[in-house]
Interface confidence: low
């Protein structure tokens, strides 16, 4: 008699029990976090934690702690019920604890800058370590009122997991307060201080005459010379040098919330806005079969690209994750890991005229800094939740 458990049908360490009463002839008893007849599906189980206004429910990074919501359309709070903050200085003012607000202009429309009392030095005059912040640090959900350098930006929750994006930048210069405020602060215009968020660059943006043309020709496989500038996003990498295989060059894996019905448009928008923001060429990578390297999250391929360590058999044996995460959401939003190629050929000490992060780790710090000061979310088609840089590797030698 054939033992239905002989083929080890249960994934992720599930235990198999042969039973005549089951349609498959066996039952898998799944470990915590997995479900399905063969334990192949991740089960973030948001339970009664419901994400409103299209928000996506994500498992907590800490076992035994609440799931978190990645909110869309500017909504916030643990359940995405907090309405979007007004643009600029409001009302209500985004500056807490009697901070004074001044409006700024930027890529994402009107912004703001807070002038804060010394006792509350966060970008919105938050008080890191304030009452109610204990225990929230590092729980995966950004608590804006607990975000600031003193508390490592809510334990990295508000800065893409990077505890201190300005590490190495002299603290007395307080560049995290001045970052991307629309004014040039020479003391912050260095690699360590993240080039003052490019506030010192001229021209600051792609000229309107070129912008639409460069948008229409972004990463189309042809080098548009007029678009091959930092402020126009280096034509999405179309003009990068031919030497070296782009498949093995540096890349960024981004965990982002997008809406599948408009996925292509959103991927394009994501690549272009990040190219313009970071002043490097960025594009969605393709795999060997010519498919976009975009993977539903959670899922084995997605987590591998994000740098997660796992059982070496996971990839081959895990069923493909086709179910978007967050059955409990009331929208079509879903989590995706998007692998983006990066053209850093114009950055670095050899190109002093092109001031941009010259390695993927610095790109991550720059993105983390933007997230920390609230400058990233308004630009993107959906919340960016994590970034994993890959420095690039040499292609394997041909096996003859």
């Amino acid at each position: 008699e054939i033992d239905p458990c002989h083929s080890q049908p249960c994934f992720h360490g599930g235990t198999c029990e042969a039973t005549a009463g089951s349609p498959l002839g066996f039952i898998c008893h799944c470990p915590k976090g997995f479900e399905g007849p063969t334990c192949s599906h991740r089960a973030p189980s948001c339970g009664f934690h419901h994400c409103h206004h299209g928000g996506l429910c994500l498992p907590s990074p800490k076992p035994g702690f609440p799931p978190r919501c990645a909110c869309l359309s500017g909504y916030g709070g643990p359940d995405c019920l907090t309405p979007p903050a007004p643009k600029g200085c409001g009302p209500p003012s985004p500056c807490l604890y009697n901070g004074s607000c001044s409006e700024t202009t930027g890529l994402g429309g009107p912004g703001f800058r807070c002038s804060c009392p010394h006792s509350s030095p966060g970008p919105r005059c938050q008080k890191p370590g304030a009452k109610g912040c204990e225990g929230r640090s590092g729980d995966g959900a950004c608590d804006a009122g607990c975000s600031g350098p003193g508390g490592n930006w809510d334990g990295g929750d508000c800065s893409l997991g990077v505890p201190d994006p300005w590490k190495g930048c002299p603290s007395h210069s307080r560049c995290w307060l001045l970052f991307r405020d629309g004014q040039c602060h020479p003391q912050c215009d260095s690699e360590e201080c993240l080039f003052d968020g490019y506030d010192c660059e001229t021209p600051p943006a792609c000229t309107p005459a070129y912008d639409q043309y460069c948008h229409d020709h972004f990463h189309n496989g042809h080098c548009e010379k007029g678009c091959n500038t930092a402020e126009c996003g280096w034509d999405g990498g179309d003009c990068r040098p031919e030497d070296g295989d782009p498949e093995w060059g540096p890349s960024l894996a981004l965990l982002v919330v997008l809406s599948p019905p408009a996925l292509d448009q959103q991927l394009f928008a994501l690549a272009r806005v990040l190219s313009l923001t970071l002043r490097v060429g960025l594009w969605v990578r393709k795999d060997r079969d010519g498919r976009d390297m975009v993977y539903p999250y959670p899922g084995a391929r997605a987590e591998e690209k994000l740098g997660g360590t796992r059982d070496p058999t996971y990839q081959e044996r895990a069923a493909p994750q086709t179910q978007p995460l967050g059955k409990e959401t009331d929208s079509l939003s879903a989590g995706f890991v998007v692998v983006m190629g990066v053209d850093l050929s114009r950055c670095g000490p050899d190109h002093p005229a092109s001031r941009c992060p010259w390695d993927p780790g610095l790109l991550l710090r720059f993105l983390a800094a933007m997230a920390a000061v609230g400058a990233l979310e308004p630009l993107l088609p959906g919340p960016l939740l994590a970034v994993h840089p890959h420095a690039g590797t040499a292609p394997p030698a041909n096996q003859l």
Epitope: C30, K32, E35, P37, G47, F48, G64, F65, K327
Partner: antibody, heavy 115, light 107 residues
Framework: EVQLVESGGGLVQPGGSLRLSCAAS????????MSWVRQAPGKGLELVAT????????YYPDSVKGRFTISRDNSKNTLYLQMGSLKAEDMAVYYC????????WGQGTLVTVSS | DIQMTQSPSSLSASVGDRVTITCKAS??????VAWYQQKPGKVPKLLIY???TRHTGVPSRFSGSGSGTDFTLTISSLQPEDVATYYC?????????FGQGTKVEIK
Amino acid sequence: EVQLVESGGGLVQPGGSLRLSCAASGFTFSSYGMSWVRQAPGKGLELVATINSNGGRTYYPDSVKGRFTISRDNSKNTLYLQMGSLKAEDMAVYYCARDQGFAYWGQGTLVTVSS
Amino acid sequence: DIQMTQSPSSLSASVGDRVTITCKASQDVGTAVAWYQQKPGKVPKLLIYWASTRHTGVPSRFSGSGSGTDFTLTISSLQPEDVATYYCQQYSSYPWTFGQGTKVEIK
């Protein structure tokens, strides 16, 4: 408005069987895990069975394992509890409840086990 | 299974008093703890989930705290309508388990 309505309780002899139903309305039933919780007269609350949103996973405490089966029909928005080999200690009010933090409960149905 | 041990099993306090009920888990449950109120002859009602989050419509005099193995439900100012039995519950590991209950009465 979320509503959970249990039915199927009644008097049964020891060793007998009973099937409880819970009709759900006012929310997307197929998106939520569901549970049965019981309360013996004058006693505390005890979780009897839990099922995840798609019916793929079920959980039971040792006290009912092998005797009770929880199931659901998402097309009918209905949760079931098939109880077998009933004992005197199974006598209780049986509630169906939504989620792991039971924010919503039915009014309960009484199961009496007596000869 | 994880045991949830509540104390005291019953208490009597005056209106306006601060009342504290504790719940100890036999192993670490993170913050996956809920508290319920059950009035005589009524269905249990969710008060607190994730250890400290008040459920919609629950008066602010009810608060929860704790993580790991030790949890507390506090009623800051006891009211006559708070006479009930209170239960803690863990939902960190299956099967989810309840404490044995704490009966609160007015002196």
